[in-house]
Interface confidence: low
Amino acid sequence: DAHKSEVAHRFKDLGEENFKALVLIAFAQYLQQCPFEDHVKLVNEVTEFAKTCVADESAENCDKSLHTLFGDKLCTVATLRETYGEMADCCAKQEPERNECFLQHKDDNPNLPRLVRPEVDVMCTAFHDNEETFLKKYLYEIARRHPYFYAPELLFFAKRYKAAFTECCQAADKAACLLPKLDELRDEGKASSAKQRLKCASLQKFGERAFKAWAVARLSQRFPKAEFAEVSKLVTDLTKVHTECCHGDLLECADDRADLAKYICENQDSISSKLKECCEKPLLEKSHCIAEVENDEMPADLPSLAADFVESKDVCKNYAEAKDVFLGMFLYEYARRHPDYSVVLLLRLAKTYETTLEKCCAAADPHECYAKVFDEFKPLVEEPQNLIKQNCELFEQLGEYKFQNALLVRYTKKVPQVSTPTLVEVSRNLGKVGSKCCKHPEAKRMPCAEDYLSVVLNQLCVLHEKTPVSDRVTKCCTESLVNRRPCFSALEVDETYVPKEFNAETFTFHADICTLSEKERQIKKQTALVELVKHKPKATKEQLKAVMDDFAAFVEKCCKADDKETCFAEEGKKLVAASQAALGL
């Protein structure tokens, strides 16, 4: 339905508060270096303009597209050229090229200072002094650091952030109340950002068809009682929502997400029995709850898949008539029967089925050719099962920190050209799969583990894309979305890598390590471990373990010393010499 003024339409649909928040998120995700005050000024100008259009949709410029209005506003920023360099060239383009240009300049790893959490009293004072500014700052700081954060979900995080301060700033022990809540929001926020980044990568790098296949598989697992037509409708609507958000169309995205939640709740009887509680919540909580809802129970007595997809004489006819619909039905039927499989495994099976039909439906005896197609699935299913079993055993034996270290060594040997901070970040996240998924029973381990690994490996892919240094990473990231994890798993030690020159400075530590949090101290040690492997890629596990044990003892000893700095200087030299000898550097 066409509206005379798109900006007035969205302002009325979303309300002033959400409109302003979403415009702030959009601007901060595009111009990630701009000061907070500049963004607030731009948002206020857009909001005042939107109000004039609500009053009179025929007013001047009210008929312009949102991209035109927002792009024109962003291009008024005086420091665009000096702050963003070539991004300023986007402003010379016309829509839709201008928006595409802005999108291409989004930076997954912007050069911004680490967010430091002030003291609780300082935060509570700021919250009470100006609640609106305090919450806007939260949106701004998260959005600029996570330029693909799912905007309507960020509104939900901001609502929880506000609730935490409202409750805890009145508590007797403010810190005890607030800090765990902020930690939880931070961890959930990072996870949410990474999950959304994969959705956007899927759409932008592999296209709508890839995203829709993912959505069919996931929604069929979640809503196994829903009819195929119902799942297809949800997939179409969900694809529109994520296409909009990934494309920077945040007002449309939030509006359409609200409509989708409304539709799901109005039709929950034909979708899932698990939606009742979600549908009683307010809008932001409702949408979040639906997105996280547990899988419904599988219908009893589902017939064998073989009848329709292998034994039927009409397989090739049905496939030829509507390939994507037929493959969609296969994926739907397989996924609703297999909540115990990861989505990426289901997509691999569907791809194998498609490849077999492409080959066999052109053969002399198609049925004879594809009769054993399900047998081809067995090794595909067993590979992630075995991998998860082995890694969960290793995790249970080592614990999270040492399991991360094992992965650090493994991945540094596979792709040593990747920057040390990226290897540390990605390997630490890969290692978290243990505590996240290994506690689950067998039936839930694979969907938990492999789909989580897809999210983490996508982080590696987007960071590497910004500064490509390894052909092997590029190959695994670009060849097949669903085979990224098996591709990385299959990589062996990179024999072409020329070890890094030894630099004593890399292994020089100071007393400041003693005041770091446990997490930061781990990161320092893991950074040193990666550098060790880069210097000596052929070092054995035993050699590396010995050096890391010595290193841990050295840190512990010097942190207990009276003159810490002298201890770090003198004992550090000895440690470097001993490590060089142990590793033959």
Epitope: P35, F36, V116, R117, P118, E119, K137, T515
Partner: nanobody, 115 residues
Framework: QVQLVESGGGLVQPGGSLRLSCAAS????????MSWVRQAPGKGPEWVSA????????RYAESIKGRFTISRDNAKKTLYLQMNSLKPEDTAVYYC????????GSQGTQVTVSS
Amino acid sequence: QVQLVESGGGLVQPGGSLRLSCAASGFTFGSFGMSWVRQAPGKGPEWVSAIDSGGTDTRYAESIKGRFTISRDNAKKTLYLQMNSLKPEDTAVYYCTIGQSTSRGSQGTQVTVSS
């Protein structure tokens, strides 16, 4: 009461140097990252540089990289900004902030670079 008091500003010729200080009180200085922010006449605040609580992780805006150095002395509860090779475009009020907020909570110190 959180207090941040900047000093060390002044008039300097292009190519000259200045060292700004920021004395902190009313909060545990050693537990927080700190930033320097500046505001040129008629412009919005611009983040300049940040340093983590321990003084090991430092970040700089592209416009001042290689010319300015941020440091801190936790024992003295003081943040520093050593500014070398100053240019006319560095003229601004400089102020320090907790974390990397660009909202000014202090008076700042005026730096003018002119011949």
